[in-house]
Interface confidence: low
């Protein structure tokens, strides 16, 4: 097909050579044929397409990714020569940096069903060069990391050695999806959840007396947690002796807290020492009663509906563990006097 | 005066359902004893079924053979307590009695109801 | 689930004779035990608890003993009203509920 008529594209794509590294290319069809037809500017309101758009602003996947060779060869199907490059809907992931992905990529809808839709593709000229010598050595990376439940920032790595006085206009993408108002080098992420997880884009102009050029860096975004290093400890009870009424109800709360773990098993049980015998409490259950992002506090209580003489020579423990090690708290029953 | 009435008893068939209530007054259903229910059948023993602590927690207890058949249960707002059973056999037929216990020193039964006879029998 | 053995089953006596009952518990239940009092058409009445405390309005002609596993209610004088089915029933209780479990009766009658 023609591709003269496709709307022209130029990207860079600076790599480092000392990271692992992708590159993605959205298939930006005009915005009003993006939004809905590619023809419907010709259309006047009360006209109807005699075909079903090509493509909706929901389902972009139904496109289809060229490369232009350098020698003027025809047009050749992504999918059948270049395996390091992979389609995901209307994005072309670039597995492995190099610069012999620069080239012509074309995208245009799979499905020709008007003369209008010929017009209907993008020519996105890319050139891949890997960076100098010269290039910022500390700039951010493009596996980046958040720590959930904290304040954090991803860095636009072809940008990060900029200032922000310096840096010009960027457009960000996260899964593909325009970040409207994320305008500079640097989007700060006031408390990290795990939705801020995912793929990144940076876009900024940059432009020369003859032509100007999207610089454009990907950059994947894991939220994590710093697992706990501590034992869970005990907050309550904290004495090891309580004063009781004889045939009065009883309670005793256990309260815990246990740090962050990727992989939670949190064990708060009470077990009850009676001379050389031990044994397990049938308890209610535990309950998580505050619960933030970097811990946990857990309250197990063991009811005694009526102390008994017996349970004041008994040793209440409770016990809490978790993947680092355990805690335990005894306490014995006395009787109140008076 | 403080009491302990039973109400509910009847002839029933293997495998049919009752309810039993117990009505108390002069005290409320929701302090620091446990409601039971004892029954006995005709010419022996008093055998322990079930019991519902009155305080907040109403946890509940069974002897091993009435767990899954019968329920105890308490109605506070009508100061009364209910032992429904299902699947009834031949060997439930008894009397079955409502008790309180003594608030202190272990749980010995101060508070006996008259008792309701449950007839098991097709 | 504790066992409470009761012996003897039954026992002729005579009015003003000194009566033992005794009950033993399959493990140690300390002091928690409770005598009972049955008449026939009638529901059990509480003579005793804590093993050997005395039930209010309960005449101290009767009285218990023992604690662990061995207990005895004895009748000093047997009065007429006295004949009558006795029981003795586990009254432990703690974190983990133990079943009320009773002993399978003395029945005591006139000689």
């Known amino acids: 097909f023609n591709i003269s008529g496709c709307s022209t594209k130029k990207l860079l794509w600076t790599y480092s050579t000392r990271s692992e590294e992708e590159f993605v290319l959205f298939c930006d069809l005009p915005e009003p044929q993006k939004s809905h037809f590619c023809h419907r500017n010709r259309l006047s309101p009360k006209q109807v397409p005699e075909h079903l758009p090509f493509m909706g602003s929901n389902d972009l996947s139904d496109v289809q990714w060229y490369q232009q060779p350098s020698n003027g060869d025809p047009l050749e199907d992504i999918r059948k020569s270049y395996p390091h490059i992979i389609q995901d809907k209307c994005t072309l992931h670039f597995l492995t940096p190099g610069v012999n992905n620069s080239g012509s990529y074309i995208c245009r809808p799979k499905m020709i069903k008007s003369p209008y839709d010929v017009a209907c593709c993008v020519k996105m000229i890319l050139e891949v060069k890997p960076q100098t010598n010269a290039s910022c050595e500390y700039s951010a990376s493009h596996k980046q990391d958040l720590l959930l439940g904290s304040t954090g920032s991803i860095s636009c790595p072809s940008l990060s050695c900029q200032s922000d006085a310096q840096s010009p206009a960027v457009t960000w993408y996260k899964n593909g999806k325009l970040l409207s108002v994320e305008r500079s080098n640097r989007i700060v992420v006031d408390e990290v959840y795990d939705y801020h997880q995912g793929t990144y884009v940076c876009d900024y102009t940059q432009s020369d007396t003859v032509s100007s050029w999207t610089v454009r860096a990907v950059v994947q975004v894991r939220t994590i947690v710093g697992d706990t290093k501590l034992k869970p400890d005990i907050l309550d009870p904290v004495e090891d002796t309580l004063e009781v009424e004889l045939g009065k109800p009883l309670t005793i709360s256990c309260k815990a807290r246990f740090g962050f773990e990727r992989v939670f098993n949190p064990v708060i049980k009470w077990y009850i020492k009676d001379s050389d015998l031990e044994w397990e409490v049938s308890v209610p259950e535990a309950k998580s009663i505050k619960s933030t992002l970097k811990d946990e506090i857990i309250e197990r209580n063991i009811i005694l509906e009526k102390v008994t003489q017996r349970d004041l020579r008994r040793k209440f423990v409770c016990f809490v563990q978790n993947s680092i090690g355990n805690t335990t708290q005894s306490v014995q029953l006395k009787e109140k006097r008076g | 005066e403080v009491q302990l009435e039973e109400s509910g008893g009847d002839l029933v068939q293997p495998g049919g359902s009752l309810r039993l209530s117990c009505a108390a007054s002069?005290?409320?259903?929701?302090?620091?004893?446990?409601i039971c229910w004892v029954r006995q059948a005709p010419g022996k023993g008093l055998e322990w079924v079930a019991c519902?602590?009155?305080?907040?927690?109403?946890?509940?207890y069974y002897a091993s053979w009435a767990k899954g058949r019968f329920t105890i249960s308490r109605d506070t707002s009508k100061n009364t307590l209910y032992l429904q059973m299902n699947s009834l056999r031949a060997e439930d037929t008894a009397v079955y009695f409502c008790?309180?216990?003594?608030?202190?020193?272990?749980?010995?039964?101060?508070?006996w109801g008259q008792g309701t006879l449950v007839t098991v029998s097709s | 689930d504790i066992q409470m053995t009761q012996s003897p089953s039954s026992l002729s006596a005579s009015v003003g004779d000194r009566v033992t009952i005794t009950c033993q518990a399959s493990?140690?239940?300390?002091?928690?035990l409770a005598w009972y009092q049955q008449k026939p058409g009638q529901a059990p009445k509480l003579l005793i608890y804590?093993?050997?405390k005395l039930a209010s309005g309960v005449p101290s002609r009767f009285s218990g003993s023992g604690s662990g596993t061995d207990f005895t209610l004895t009748i000093s004088s047997l009065q007429p009203e006295d004949f009558a089915t006795y029981y003795c029933q586990c009254t432990l209780y703690g974190v983990n509920f133990v079943p009320n479990v009773f002993g399978g009766g003395t029945k005591v009658v006139i000689k």
């Open positions: 002069g005290f409320s259903f929701n302090g620091n004893y446990y």
């Open positions: 008790v309180r216990d003594k608030p202190a020193g272990g749980s010995s039964y101060t508070l």
């Open positions: 493990e140690d239940i300390e002091s928690y």
């Open positions: 519902i602590y009155a305080g907040s927690s109403g946890s509940t």
């Open positions: 804590q093993a050997s």
